[in-house]
């Protein structure tokens, strides 16, 4: 229904808390530049006209849409261009284009420093202190880093955050009871990130239907005994939540994301028998549950699906009749039966299967031709199954670390004129899903294998759009979003590269190394790794590996040495000439 | 809404000729293969003709082979049916359907060829 006052409407709806919490994401994803006091600055004035508006919805400007009034606000800042450059052009435009302009200036690769986590001691007096101011920050950081990131998602990350910290600053080892939780949240949180980067690219290069299938195939896999009606439902419920947010209409998002929370917990019986659990928990617990809900236990008596989409002989008069909820019906159907199915590979089988009922459907006997459709899949089921069996066994085999550089050989490769930060950055986390997919049951592996290596290479295409440098990561990052991962597999060593001449202060290194965390010691090793092929891109894996532990021993010598310095100024050259030798 | 309306049936004699017309409505008519089929006085659906959506391939059931043309013309969204040199067993209703279906969804065209 209308209101009179969306503003009051939606304050009303959410609650003080997470109204301003939702306000704070909002601007921090738009201006990513300014400080936390500017944006609660804003926030409190804007939560303070929405007082005034539940008080009054007839008040001056209560009327006003919600990306007028918040663009307002963030138009107003003082030195806007100076800070933000052409960003500040978005001002001189009306709604709707000026909200489209502030997303265009969205920055998924923002220049900020890493988020450092202060000491627990530090952290816990702070928090003490003022838990909100606390808490704020957090959002603000985060939301700064990661301007898609999900709102509503992010306020449940920030309660983990809280909880966590309310228990552990009680305890005498504050640092032994933060460090694990909150590294676990951070994981959480960083995989949450990419994973919605995804479904907002989805959104905004395909539009909502491509959305909507994927979000059909993820209902259909956790929700098997729902019906087709039921799952269209909660598809364009969810299709509509996420627009908001990528949209960056967060305070709609949240609130539409509550609403569909309700609606499943109060139709457990057509949707699943897994729900009551998440249904008893509060709000935000309850929405992120529900979204990672495990699988409902699927019906046992469901036919061959070729009865209805091969055996028929309506298949191409249902088609013609309806071709979107044809297709949508093949979907669920192939989808509930298939949770081991990764849903990249359930729409890329769907894609087949719409491509043959084209080809075929047009023929003087479609079912000769579509007929064999079924059997067609086999090699586009069997391409990621053998992705994961490979890539999970060098997993097993060399551990992270090593599965990680093995990762970033193979992808700067690929791509060797990708910037080493970018190709390190990519490798790690390309590199993790070993750590995170591998270990589980084996039906589960492919779904969680492929469909994380898809979100991955999502940011890989999205850092390249910026500066595109590579053919090779253009050809596979224009395709649909489905095909990106087999591309980026099925690519080989850039044959157009021409090697980067041997710079020997790119592999000379300091004592400062020592010192440094075992992750930023990592990420060293693999900067060197990846310059490395780039110097020599048909290094075979026998010569990459005699230089790397090589340098292992090299830095292991050094940092045990009295005098790091004078071994790291008289080994090191050394090192670089063995390692010129050794890839000759 | 899929619609497929038959007309141009009729009683004619052994060994004349008659026309039947299929309009077609609610699909993309010239991207499907279309069909006609028929059902004779207490037997079954039978397979008559099929062409393909750009009307470049036709196929004919043994019976009317060369007595039978299919034919489209996709800019009207029609499918024909030239049928020649009837036959007392071509006594049926006779049905156009998307693709290769044996199903009919439509009213049908009685044919009947009697002397």
């Known amino acids: 229904e209308a209101h009179k006052s969306e503003i009051a409407h939606r304050y009303n709806d959410l609650g003080e808390q997470h109204f301003k919490g939702l306000v704070l994401i909002a601007f921090s994803q738009y201006l990513q530049k300014c400080s936390y006091d500017e944006h609660a600055k804003l926030v409190q004035e804007v939560t303070d006209f929405a007082k005034t508006c539940v008080a009054d919805e007839s008040a001056a400007n209560c009327d006003k849409s919600l990306h007028t009034l918040f663009g307002d606000k963030l138009c107003a800042i003082p030195n806007l261009r100076e800070n933000y450059g052409e960003l500040a052009d978005c001002c001189t435009k009306q709604e709707p284009e000026r909200n489209e302009c502030f997303l265009q200036h969205k920055d998924d690769n923002p220049s900020l420093p890493p988020f450092e986590r202060p000491e627990a001691e530090a952290m816990c007096t702070s928090f003490k202190e003022n838990p909100t101011t606390f808490m704020g920050h957090y959002l603000h950081e985060v939301a700064r880093r990661h301007p898609y990131f999900y709102a509503p998602e992010l306020l449940y990350y920030a309660e983990q955050y809280n909880e966590i910290l309310t228990q552990c600053c009680a305890e005498a080892d504050k640092e032994s009871c933060l460090t694990p939780k909150l590294d676990g949240v951070k994981e959480k949180a960083l995989v949450s990130s990419v994973r919605q980067r995804m479904k907002c690219s989805s959104m905004q290069k395909f539009g909502e239907r491509a959305f909507k299938a994927w979000a059909v195939a993820r209902l259909s896999q956790t929700f098997p005994n729902a019906d087709f009606a039921e799952i269209t439902k909660l598809a364009t419920d969810l299709t509509k939540v996420n627009k908001e947010c990528c949209h960056g209409d967060l305070l709609e998002c949240a609130d539409d994301r509550a609403e569909l929370a309700k609606y499943m917990c109060e139709n457990q019986a057509t949707i699943s028998s897994k729900l009551q659990t998440c249904c008893d928990k509060p709000l935000l617990k309850k929405a992120h549950c529900l979204s990672e809900v495990e699988h409902d236990t699927m019906p046992a008596d469901l036919p061959a699906i070729a009865a209805d989409f091969v055996e028929d002989q309506e298949v191409c008069k249902n088609y013609a009749e309806a071709k979107d909820v044809f297709l949508g019906t093949f979907l669920y159907e192939y989808s509930r039966r298939h949770p081991d199915y990764s849903v990249s590979l359930l729409l890329r089988l769907a894609k087949k299967y719409e491509a043959t009922l084209e080809k075929c459907c047009a023929e003087a006997n479609p079912p000769a031709c579509y007929g064999t459709v079924l059997a067609e899949f086999q090699p586009l089921v069997e391409e990621p199954k053998n992705l994961v069996k490979t890539n999970c066994d060098l997993y097993e085999k060399l551990g992270e670390y090593g599965f990680q550089n093995a990762i970033l050989v193979r992808y700067t490769q690929k791509a060797p004129q990708v910037s080493t930060p970018t190709l390190v950055e990519a490798a790690r986390n390309l590199g993790r899903v070993g750590t995170k997919c591998c270990t589980l049951p084996e039906d589960q592996r492919l779904p969680c294998v492929e469909d994380y290596l898809s979100a991955i290479l999502n940011r890989v295409c999205l850092l390249h759009e910026k500066t595109p440098v590579s053919e090779h990561v253009t050809k596979c990052c224009s395709g649909s979003l489905v095909e990106r991962r087999p591309c980026f597999s099925a690519l080989t060593v850039d044959e157009t590269y021409v090697p980067k001449e041997f710079k020997a202060e790119t592999f000379t290194f300091h004592s400062d190394i020592c010192t440094l965390p075992e992750k930023e010691k990592q990420i060293k090793k693999q900067t060197a790794l990846a310059e490395l092929v780039k110097h020599k891109p048909k290094a075979t894996a026998e010569q990459l590996k005699t230089v790397m532990d090589d340098f292992a021993q090299f830095l292991d010598t050094c940092c045990k040495a009295a005098d790091k310095d004078t071994c790291f100024s008289t080994e090191g050259p050394n090192l670089v000439t063995r390692c010129k030798d050794a890839l000759a | 809404k899929v619609q497929l309306v038959e007309s141009g049936g009729g009683l004619v004699q052994p060994g004349n000729s008659l026309r039947l017309s299929c309009a077609a409505s609610?699909?993309?008519?010239?991207?499907?293969?279309m069909s006609w089929v028929r059902q004779a006085p207490g037997k079954g659906l039978e397979w008559v003709s099929s062409?393909?959506?750009?009307?470049?391939?036709?196929l004919y059931a043994d019976s009317v082979r060369g007595r039978f043309t299919i034919s489209r013309d996709n800019s009207k969204n029609t499918l024909y049916l030239q049928m020649n040199s009837l036959r007392a067993e071509d006594t049926a209703v006779y049905y156009c359907t998307i693709g290769g279906s044996l199903r009919a969804s439509s009213q049908g065209t009685l044919v009947t060829v009697s002397s």
């Open positions: 609610g699909f993309t008519f010239s991207s499907f293969g």
């Open positions: 062409i393909s959506g750009g009307g470049s391939d036709t």
